[in-house]
């Protein structure tokens, strides 16, 4: 069964900067990736970036840089201030589509250990969810 992994990291050097990394563990080729965010339990969500292998990348504030890392993984840098700044209980979701096989989503949030005064772990364990 295909799976999606998500890592969320707060940058130690810029406390309002977050990096989201997502990847697809499956055999199909990726036709589209959508990154979204919102409150816990599905509250108040919106799209941050859409990545299409042929048609390009679209991103919306506070997303600063979305890019492909490999053919099956992406990264997204968020820079927030004020109302658009992510907080500790913000949920980030990545949905990978592999046409025509299907699509899969996983969500994650900042690890509890990522106190603003502490350095986030360099390689947080992936958060997996396969529906």
């Amino acid at each position: 069964t295909p799976e999606v992994w998500v890592q969320v990291r707060m940058e130690a050097t810029e406390l309002s900067s977050f990096t989201i990394r997502c990847g697809f563990l499956g055999s199909g080729s990726i036709s589209l990736v959508t990154v979204s965010w919102g409150g816990p339990n599905g509250a108040g969500g919106t799209t941050l970036a859409v990545l299409h292998p042929e048609r390009g990348i679209r991103q919306w504030a506070p997303a600063r840089q979305a890019r492909w890392e490999t053919q099956s993984s992406i990264s997204l840098i968020l820079e927030g201030s004020g109302a658009s700044s992510p907080c500790a209980n913000t949920t980030f979701c990545c949905k990978f589509a592999s046409f025509p096989e299907g699509s899969w989503e996983a969500c994650g949030s900042l690890p509890p250990s990522s106190d603003p005064g502490l350095s986030a772990p360099p390689t947080p364990a992936p958060i997996l969810r396969a529906d």
Epitope: S31, L32, T34, G38, C93, D131
Partner: nanobody, 127 residues
Framework: EVQLVESGGGLVQPGGSLRLSCAAS????????MSWVRQAPGKGLEWVST????????SYVDSVKGRFTISRDNSKNTLYLQMNSLRAEDTAVYYC????????????????????WGQGTMVTVSS
């Protein structure tokens, strides 16, 4: 795995009404924009309507404005398309999809340009 399941299609006379539903599961439905697209027999895929994640913003192709209404119920993970004053040219397979096709343009639209897609429901408008 994400699932989008459309229902509500069928045979209707010109001037009649139908309400399509799309039940979503396997993803955080309330975080995503949703759209309806359609494919008439022998034609390409056509965008019909889009609604944003909280339902506060909608858009429609000119040919259905004033006749079709898109809506969503995030508490039920369901997308709707109310179709009134149906015409023969509305005959098509209607697909529920995740995403807004305007992100990359409406030219040469394909189901692979969306984040998720359903199996489609057939709407036939004929007397």
């Amino acid at each position: 795995e994400v699932q989008l399941v459309e229902s509500g299609g069928g045979l209707v006379q010109p001037g009649g009404s139908l309400r399509l539903s799309c039940a979503a599961s396997g993803f955080t439905f309330s975080y995503y924009d949703m759209s309806w697209v359609r494919q008439a027999p022998g034609k390409g895929l056509e965008w019909v309507s889009t609604i944003n994640s909280n339902g506060g913003r909608t858009s429609y192709v000119d040919s259905v404005k004033g006749r079709f209404t898109i809506s969503r119920d995030n508490s039920k993970n369901t997308l709707y398309l109310q179709m009134n004053s149906l015409r023969a040219e509305d005959t098509a397979v209607y697909y529920c999809v995740e995403g807004d096709p305007h992100n990359f343009g409406l030219e040469s639209l394909s189901l692979r340009d969306f984040g998720s897609w359903g199996q489609g429901t057939m709407v036939t408008v004929s007397s």
